[in-house]
């Protein structure tokens, strides 16, 4: 079940996606694609970052926040009804089955006579719950210490995982502290 975001025709749409680099410059590759997240990568890529820069983008799709601080939220400029649908934000942490993928649903409404601002940056009201957990596997899995120590803060599409009693093990797979708001 995707978290739904709304925008009006002619306005800019905002799809949130965040992670917190362990240290400045310790960036993780990220891709955005139109359509639900496939098994790997992003389908129909509209924007991509690597460990240093935004290295691929298409017109109307851009990162308004500071991606070097982990704000990889996507802005779609001057949306039309055709922009409706599922978008995939994939935080591509290196390692086997180690990425974080999030499907966000964008709903475009016809323009009102008096358009109102649609960007909502205060997510506290929408996502009041905070879960912080640290995965600890057996000693053998401490190889994970060799992986980037990344805090991932995701503000979308995690309702299902909150219901998963085995969430802690999923977090162990990423070797990261994850905060879900």
């Amino acid at each position: 079940s995707e978290v739904e975001y709304r925008a009006e025709v002619g306005q800019n749409a905002y799809l949130p996606c965040f992670y917190t680099p362990a240290a400045p410059g310790n960036l993780v590759p990220v891709c955005w694609g139109k359509g639900a997240c496939p098994v790997f990568e992003c389908g129909n890529v509209v924007l991509r970052t690597d460990e240093r820069d935004v290295n691929y983008w298409t017109s109307r799709y851009w990162l308004n926040g500071d991606f070097r601080k982990g704000d990889v939220s996507l802005t779609i400029e001057n949306v039309t009804l055709a922009d409706s649908g599922i978008y995939c934000c994939r935080i591509q942490i290196p390692g086997i089955m180690n990425d974080e993928k999030f499907n966000l649903k964008l709903v475009i409404k016809p323009a009102k006579v008096t358009p109102a601002p649609t960007r909502q940056r205060d997510f506290t009201a929408a996502f009041p719950r905070m879960l912080t957990t640290r995965g600890h596997g057996p000693a053998e899995t401490q190889t994970l210490g060799s992986l980037p120590d990344i805090n991932l803060t995701q503000i979308s599409t995690l309702a299902n995982e909150l219901r998963d009693s085995r969430l802690a093990n999923d977090l162990r797979d990423s070797g990261a502290t994850i905060r879900i708001g």
């Epitope: 460990e51 591509q92 390692g95 086997i96 180690n98 190889t143 085995r166 797979d173």
Partner: antibody
Framework: QVQLQQSGGGLVHPGGSLRLSCAAS????????MTWVRQAPGKGLEWVSG????????YYADSVKGRFTISRDNSKNTLYLQMNSLRDEDTAVYYC???????????WGQGTLVTVSS | EIVMTQSPDSLAVSLGERATINCKSS????????????LAWYQQKPGQPPKLLIY???TRESGVPDRFSGSGSGTDFTLTISSLQAEDVAVYYC?????????FGQGTRLEIK
């Protein structure tokens, strides 16, 4: 001592199904990510599928997506690969393997041969 | 996907001599944030499953003889056997685990000259 004991291989007609099993001892399968790798006769290694430590995420190679299903039974400490709509090109020795963290494969099963032929 | 290409396809080396196998990835498997190369080497003998030799491109798995060593970074990697022994006859594979799908090289068959 970590061991992975495989079973379930055999001869099957194209379009048929098989379920491979990988019984683990020396560790619990719900603690580690696990994977299946196959090797066609005389060929190299091809990654097939994987499952995360919790079982919450599953991954498949394009060549098997929609036909194969990876799963596990924690109570039996066993990993499975359900293979449907089998094709001639699925003929291979299938190996299960344990993944260290999110990196390399440190323990492998002995392999089980799947032959798809009419 | 990342394509792994090994060279040579086969190699014949005299006992006690050095054997070198190369592996090239189609894109870098070095993660700059932790300076780790997400690459492993496996040995497979006939009728047996693969055996892990090297991970992180240069870290030897416990129990692996020290005549085996791995080197390289980014896209170019090498497995070296410093003094070939009879029991080293096998097929050797490199594998990247930087990003999915996990991919292996096509293998290098090592024989005794």
């Amino acid at each position: 001592q970590v061991q992975l004991q495989q079973s379930g291989g055999g001869l099957v007609h194209p379009g048929g199904s098989l379920r491979l099993s990988c019984a683990a001892s020396g560790f619990t399968v719900d603690t580690y990510a696990m994977t299946w790798v196959r090797q066609a006769p005389g060929k190299g290694l091809e990654w097939v599928s994987g499952i995360s430590g919790s079982g919450g995420s599953t991954y498949y190679a394009d060549s098997v997506k929609g036909r194969f299903t990876i799963s596990r039974d924690n109570s039996k400490n066993t990993l499975y690969l359900q293979m449907n709509s089998l094709r001639d090109e699925d003929t291979a020795v299938y190996y299960c393997a344990k993944i260290v963290g999110v990196t390399h494969f440190d323990y492998w099963g002995q392999g089980t041969l799947v032959t798809v032929s009419s | 996907e990342i394509v792994m290409t090994q060279s040579p396809d086969s190699l014949a080396v005299s006992l006690g001599e050095r054997a070198t196998i190369n592996c090239k990835s189609s894109q870098s498997v070095l993660y700059r944030s932790n300076n780790k190369n997400y690459l492993a080497w496996y040995q497979q003998k006939p009728g047996q499953p693969p055996k892990l030799l090297i991970y992180w491109a240069s870290t030897r798995e416990s129990g692996v003889p020290d005549r085996f060593s791995g080197s390289g970074s980014g896209t170019d990697f090498t497995l070296t056997i410093s003094s070939l022994q009879a029991e080293d006859v096998a097929v050797y594979y490199c594998q990247q685990y930087y990003s999915g799908p996990i991919t292996f090289g096509q293998g290098t068959r090592l024989e005794i000259k």
